[in-house]
């Protein structure tokens, strides 16, 4: 099971596999989620203790029963890996630290003038693995300024110091926000020279370009195959560096491949995780545990939930099966590669799917028609529900907005398929912020089917709301994850931290936007609102938002979008941009659909369509 | 850390009134929600309402309607359950609690309220 | 509104046992459940819920099924620690309502 929550002054006893120091506890459980052994975790602030040396001390576990004891520790702050926690698992680590110098190896210096200029720099720096900025008011006036890029052996800091005006971060290539680009070609026979920083054993050249990209130092690998002439070395995967951040020389080998890692791609990143099965191969480790069932897939599935277990083998040994039910073998090791691998077998062997994201995890994103009137420019994974709709006619463009609520549906308004029913003739693209970034090569979602609320009539307001199925299921990545939706007892509530998210008109006769826009609205009471749209019936199906002085509201081409509102610390849907009477007026509120009213339609429909429901409701 | 401390135990007469208090600490207050739970001696949960003290909304049982009132003071970070006309079956332990998303991920220690003539 | 049963009011197991704890809504609920586990004189502890999953400090031997308007717990081996007072809550439609509760005891 997935275990989210965090214990405060406490500290597990025992069960060490690994240290190291990190500016927070949210980066410890990362890096423990992606430690092979690691379950559970405890970081030490720099309040929580007096000895320098174990300040900003992260502690990783492994625990057979996956429990350890725990101690009380005053400011001590433990908790779980995350793995099995699908969408949740990401590498990606954007916070800025302020008062903090995390130390290692100094590679580059340089003037700029914000810690976001330095946190891009790193970000774009192949070598670059966190940094530190000395603000204009760092006591030693020939530092201010300072962009300080960093590597360490570990990839985290070698120390963290505390420190008046001085920033410190991560590179966000985790978060595939690289502007160096990455090479994506498989070389076959050819050997790559320079410094191994790691060696494991993979069954082929992908699972080891995964892993490349996972190492904090790895940049680019060479894999013997199974054929390689020297048998002791067959499925090494190599990973390797250099100074210069590329191989200084490659030599033609036979029965070699080599390649790069993908940390530096732009937009995505492969997941962390390796999901082929290998068959007629067997992988051998530590026994976790042995397991009667039938077929392979259901192996994995059960490696998978077992949380220590990393890699699995099935044996189809006539010996090893009675009935339809075969031995699983559950398998771990130290590196979480296996620590043999062979071949000829009747064995089928594969991965625990643990640190996949594209789970259909149960619990919703976390992350902090009609353009946003008033607004600012959004980041890269802010509003990773946000959707655009486009018709593809002579010419493409952007229609509506909508929210992404489970890998197969989107949640749209009713009105924004006013006069274009055709389900071909739409283009719906995920994970996106600039609308210019769409390209012909741009991946796109088309549509399986549109489902437009019974009671909607064009040209009413009422019942503004469509449910759109996708002809396939979308992966869940940094960029592309849906919004929770609300209870149906929700209906009443009050929400005070609002937003609304769409590339329409930043005026009333404007034009469609670029980059992805967002605005912070407070709701308006519908008692409120009627009394501003008097010739119109606001129904409690209907949610207001606005300001009274107007000035910042959505607008042409935001229809369908998001509003989400932050609140018992998750983020929700609360309703669909629907209509208004301008954009950003005096005293005329936005009018949305309120999504809390059609929970029950919104789940039937779903669950009538698929079977079960496929939403990514808090469910 | 999130902690929710209660006020005292309180020994009512019947048709009398209770405030029951709900000092928060280790979160922004308004921020969240906070919501009233009873619990009579020996028997099961019983939700009585809720307040946003971000927004002063508040939700209600219909059972508890016209005789619960809940508060919240910013400037303190605490809320109030005050519960009028009481009646025997009053008695119970009342709890707030704090949710996370929808769930009560934390509680409050309870207080005891019990009616007697 | 809607009315939560949990069919059984108490229970006794040996330690070791797999329990399973019932808890049936009036209505469908849409899998917005959460269970919560009550020690005496204390505060019911939120165990899990479809918001949150399992609350972190229960043991992985809890897991949580159902959909519709049936909902189970279980406990894969029961353990002295696990002796308590269970219910179930539902948060599809206010007002939130719980069921009665199940005491489980060891035999």
């Known amino acids: 099971g997935c275990l989210t929550q965090l214990y405060e002054n406490a500290f597990f006893r025992g069960g060490d596999v690994a240290s190291m120091y990190t500016p927070n506890a949210q980066y410890c459980q990362m890096r423990c989620t992606f430690h092979p052994r690691c379950l559970l975790f405890s970081f030490l602030p720099a309040s929580s203790i007096n000895d320098m040396e174990k300040r900003f001390g992260c502690f990783l576990k492994d625990s057979v029963t996956g429990t350890l004891p725990k101690v009380h520790r005053t400011g001590a702050v433990s908790g779980h890996s995350l793995k099995q926690c699908g969408h949740q698992i990401s590498a990606c680590h954007r916070d800025i630290y302020k008062g903090v110098d995390m130390r290692g190896v100094n590679f580059n210096v340089s003037k700029v003038s914000s810690v976001e200029e330095c946190q891009k720099r790193c970000t774009s720096n192949i070598r670059c693995q966190f940094f530190s900025y000395a603000t204009q008011t760092f006591h030693k006036a020939e530092y201010r300024n300072n962009c300080l890029l960093k590597y360490s052996p570990g990839g985290t800091p070698t120390a963290i110091k505390v420190l008046s005006n001085v920033e410190s971060g991560f590179s966000l290539k985790p978060c595939a926000l690289s502007e160096i680009g990455c090479h994506m070609n498989i070389f076959q026979h050819l050997a790559f020279s320079d410094v191994d920083v790691a060696r494991v054993l993979t069954p082929d050249a992908f699972v080891c370009r995964t892993i490349c990209t996972y190492h904090p130092n790895c940049l680019f690998f060479t894999f013997y195959t199974n054929v390689w002439k020297i048998e002791s070395q067959r499925n090494v995967c190599l990973l390797k560096t250099s100074e210069s951040g590329t191989p200084s020389s490659s030599t033609p080998q036979e029965n070699t491949i080599s390649g790069y890692s993908l940390l530096t791609c732009k937009r995505t990143l492969p997941e962390p995780c390796h999901s082929k099965i290998y068959p007629g191969v067997d992988f051998g480790g530590e026994e976790l545990n042995v397991t009667f069932v039938k077929g392979v897939n259901v192996c994995q599935e059960t490696c998978t939930k077992m949380i220590r277990c990393q890699f699995f083998t099935y044996s189809l040994l006539p010996e090893d099966c009675k009935e339809e039910k075969c031995k699983c073998f559950l398998r771990l090791s130290m590196d979480g590669s296996p620590t043999r691998i062979a071949y000829g077998t009747q064995g089928s062997s594969g991965y625990s799917l643990r640190l996949c994201n594209t789970g259909d995890n149960s619990v919703c994103t976390t992350k902090t028609s009609t353009r946003i009137v008033g607004g600012t420019n959004s980041s890269w994974g802010e509003w990773p529900w946000q959707v655009s709709l486009q018709v593809k006619l002579t010419a493409q463009r952007h229609l509506c907005g909508g929210s992404l609520i489970g890998h197969q549906w989107v949640l749209t308004a009713a009105h924004c398929f006013d006069g274009l029913p055709l389900q071909d003739v739409w283009r719906i693209y995920s994970g996106i912020l600039n609308l210019s970034d769409i390209t012909k090569d741009t991946p796109f979602s088309q549509i399986k089917e549109i489902i437009i609320h019974q009671n909607y009539k064009v040209s009413e307001g009422n019942h503004d709301i469509a449910l759109i199925k996708l002809q396939a299921p979308l992966n869940y990545t940094e960029f592309q994850k849906p919004i929770c939706l609300p209870s149906k007892g929700d209906t009443s509530t009050i929400y005070t931290n609002c937003w609304v998210t769409g590339w329409g008109f930043s005026k009333e006769k404007g034009e469609i936007q670029n980059i992805l826009q967002k605005v912070n609205i407070p709701l308006v009471t519908n008692e409120e609102c009627q009394k501003r749209y008097q010739d119109y019936k606001i129904t409690q199906r209907m949610v207001c938002a606005g300001y009274k002085e107007g000035g910042k509201d959505a607008c042409k081409g935001d229809s369908g979008g998001p509003l989400v509102c932050k609140h018992n610390g998750m983020w929700r849907l609360v309703g669909i941009t629907s209509w208004g009477e301008g954009c950003a007026r005096r005293e005329q509120p936005g009018v949305y659909t309120k999504v809390a009213e059609y929970m029950d339609w919104i789940l039937e429909k779903t669950q009538s369509s698929d079977g079960k429901a496929q939403m990514q409701s808090p469910a | 850390q999130v902690q929710l401390v209660q006020s005292g135990a309180e020994v009512k007469k019947p048709g009398a009134s209770v405030k029951v208090s709900c000092k928060a600490s280790?979160?922004?207050?308004?921020?969240?929600?906070m919501h009233w739970v009873r619990q009579p001696p020996g028997k099961g949960l019983e939700w009585i309402g809720a307040i946003h003290p971000g927004s002063g909304g508040t939700a209600y049982n219909q059972k508890f309607k016209g005789r619960v009132t809940i508060t919240a003071d910013k400037s303190t970070s605490t809320a109030y359950m005050e519960l009028s006309s009481l009646r025997s079956e009053d008695t119970a332990v009342y709890y707030c609690?704090?949710?996370?998303?929808?769930?009560?991920?934390?509680w409050g220690q309870g207080t005891l309220v019990t009616v007697s003539s | 509104d809607i009315q939560m049963t949990q069919s059984s009011s108490s229970f006794s197991g040996s330690l070791g046992d797999r329990v399973t704890i019932t808890c049936k809504a009036s209505?469908?609920?849409?899998?917005?459940l959460a269970w919560y586990q009550q020690k005496p004189g204390n505060a019911p502890r939120l165990l899990m819920s479809?918001?949150?999953g399992l609350e972190a400090g229960f043991h992985l031997r809890f897991s949580g099924s159902g959909s519709g308007k049936d909902y189970t717990l279980s406990i894969a081996s029961l353990q002295t620690e696990d002796v308590a007072t269970y219910y179930c809550?539902?948060?599809?439609?206010?007002?939130?309502?719980f069921g009665g509760g199940t005491k489980l005891e060891i035999k």
């Open positions: 609690a704090r949710p996370y998303g929808y769930p009560f991920a934390y």
């Open positions: 479809g918001e949150t």
């Open positions: 809550q539902q948060y599809w439609s206010t007002p939130w309502t």
């Open positions: 280790g979160y922004t207050f308004t921020d969240y929600e």
């Open positions: 209505e469908d609920i849409y899998n917005r």
